[in-house]
């Protein structure tokens, strides 16, 4: 009887043990599974939120490249429409130039001395902009960035003067504190006379050779033959 | 530290008129532009005016244009705001500001009060 | 002028909660917008400058947003000092204009 008990309770801690290790053998499985699918998992959710990353950077891409096309047929057109009337005024600003109220507006994104800034607007029958407002003055900011820039106002002839005539004495001045000082302290020679945008928008002059960017200016309703 | 103070309020009978002073402190006043804003009780923020630095350029509110003048004292770090034909609207805490780039107020004074009344 | 339109003009808020404040602007005002804190009694507080500018020493939990016409003052977890009336103001054309105010109440 005694040993009979205990071939069944050999035969128990067999079964026992084959069943621990074919459960260990099954975890061991699973839990390598788990692993290759949490791996898995992974694996796609970093490619899916790449994907949706270049997705959205396509999505503005797009959409960036959409406004520019609206904003370039829109210049064309009117300045088809021009072409195709009297051509006797100019509704429109040329492409790559901006439009605000009744001006239009070219930002240069290299440098180049003040006189030789003002001879490239006149060539493009503008002239360096003339600053009249608060308003104005906030959207040139705006455009024009942190960066130095040359304006339309120098005093190189005596007092200061707006290129297009502007009166000086009566219209609107953002100078930074304690400028304009026609400074001679550079060691360059002579003074500085001609102003410009400062980082902050505040204005300052300086000497007119410095290789700063510039804003040019035109009227919208100026004549299109001049 | 940095400190604005306005003085100058008080009661006032409609069509007179009243001066406002702003003494500033622990900054370098001819270096920054400063503002007026109003606020009648129990109501929002009303932008007065603005003077720059320099006393270069003065912007008013349409409400007040023709009736207030700002001013300043560069030499004394002080500004006014110079009130006349006053009204019953014109009742309000006056402060005075600094100016932070064209319209950005970043340090306040603690405010005065103008009450226009018969 | 420029008429600002703030909404809500009141809101009730738990601490802890994430707030969001809309303003919006009659026409485009670019990013030259300031937001201002104020409590009761009290003078206003600058809090951000050309919409999404941080002014030195104003917690983080504070943010701006927008362009255009359309802004956002968000506080990301509401703090029990927060509760004030908040101010948004252009700058981009004179007369300078504020918004009407909205009112951050203790639910």
């Known amino acids: 009887q005694n040993s009979k008990l205990q071939e069944e309770l050999q035969a128990l801690r067999e079964t026992f043990s084959n069943l621990t290790a074919s459960t260990d053998a099954k975890v061991k499985t699973l839990s390598m599974q788990g692993g290759n699918v949490g791996r898995k998992m992974k694996s796609l959710e970093s490619q899916l939120e790449k994907q949706q990353q270049d997705l959205s950077e396509d999505h503005s891409s797009l959409l960036l490249h959409v406004k520019q096309f609206v904003s370039d047929l829109r210049s064309l057109s009117c300045q088809m429409a021009v072409l195709q009337g009297n051509g006797s005024e100019r509704t429109c600003c040329p492409v790559n130039w901006v439009g605000y109220e009744g001006s239009c507006y070219w930002f240069s994104r290299s440098g180049k001395p003040w006189p030789e800034a003002e001879k490239y607007c006149q060539l493009e029958n503008a002239h360096l902009v003339v600053v009249g407002s608060w308003e104005e003055q906030k959207f040139i900011q705006h455009h024009v960035g942190p960066v130095n820039s040359w304006i339309g106002l120098t005093d190189q002839s005596g007092p200061w003067k707006w290129v297009d005539g502007t009166d000086y004495e009566s219209g609107f001045k953002n100078w930074r504190p304690e400028q304009p000082d026609d400074w001679y302290g550079h060691g360059l020679g002579g003074g500085e006379d001609c102003a410009h945008f400062t980082e902050d928008g505040g204005w300052n002059d300086d000497i007119c050779q410095r290789p700063y960017r510039w804003v040019c200016e035109t009227q919208r309703d100026r004549d299109s033959g001049s | 530290q940095v400190q604005l103070v306005e003085s100058g309020g008080g009661v006032v009978q409609p069509g007179r008129s009243l001066r406002l002073s702003c003494a500033a402190s622990?900054?370098?006043?001819?270096?920054?532009?400063m503002h007026w804003v109003r606020q009648a009780p129990g109501k929002g923020l009303e932008w007065v005016a603005i003077?720059?630095?320099?006393?270069?350029?003065?912007y008013y509110a349409d409400s007040v244009k023709g009736r207030f003048t700002i001013s300043r004292d560069n030499s004394n770090n002080t500004l006014y705001l110079q009130m006349s034909s006053l009204r019953a609207e014109d009742t309000a805490v006056y402060y005075c500001?600094?100016?932070?780039?064209?319209?950005?107020?970043?340090?306040w004074g603690q405010g005065t009060t103008v009450t226009v009344s018969s | 002028d420029i008429q600002m339109t703030q909404s809500p003009s009141s809101l009730s808020a738990s601490v802890g909660d994430r707030v969001t404040i809309a303003c919006r602007a009659s026409?485009?005002?670019?990013?030259?917008l300031n937001w201002y804190q104020q409590k009761p009694g009290k003078a206003p507080k600058f809090l951000i400058y050309?919409?999404?500018s941080l002014q030195s020493g104003v917690p983080s939990r504070f943010s701006g947003s927008g362009s255009g016409t359309d802004f956002t003052l968000t506080i990301s977890s509401l703090q029990p000092e927060d509760f004030a009336i908040y101010y948004c103001?252009?700058?981009?054309?004179?007369?300078?204009?504020f918004g009407g105010g909205t009112k951050v109440e203790i639910k």
């Open positions: 500001a600094r100016d932070l780039s064209m319209g950005g107020m970043d340090v």
């Open positions: 622990g900054f370098t006043f001819s270096s920054f532009g």
């Open positions: 003077i720059w630095h320099d006393g270069s350029n003065k």
């Open positions: 026409q485009n005002i670019i990013s030259y």
């Open positions: 050309t919409a999404s």
């Open positions: 103001q252009q700058t981009y054309s004179t007369p300078l204009t």
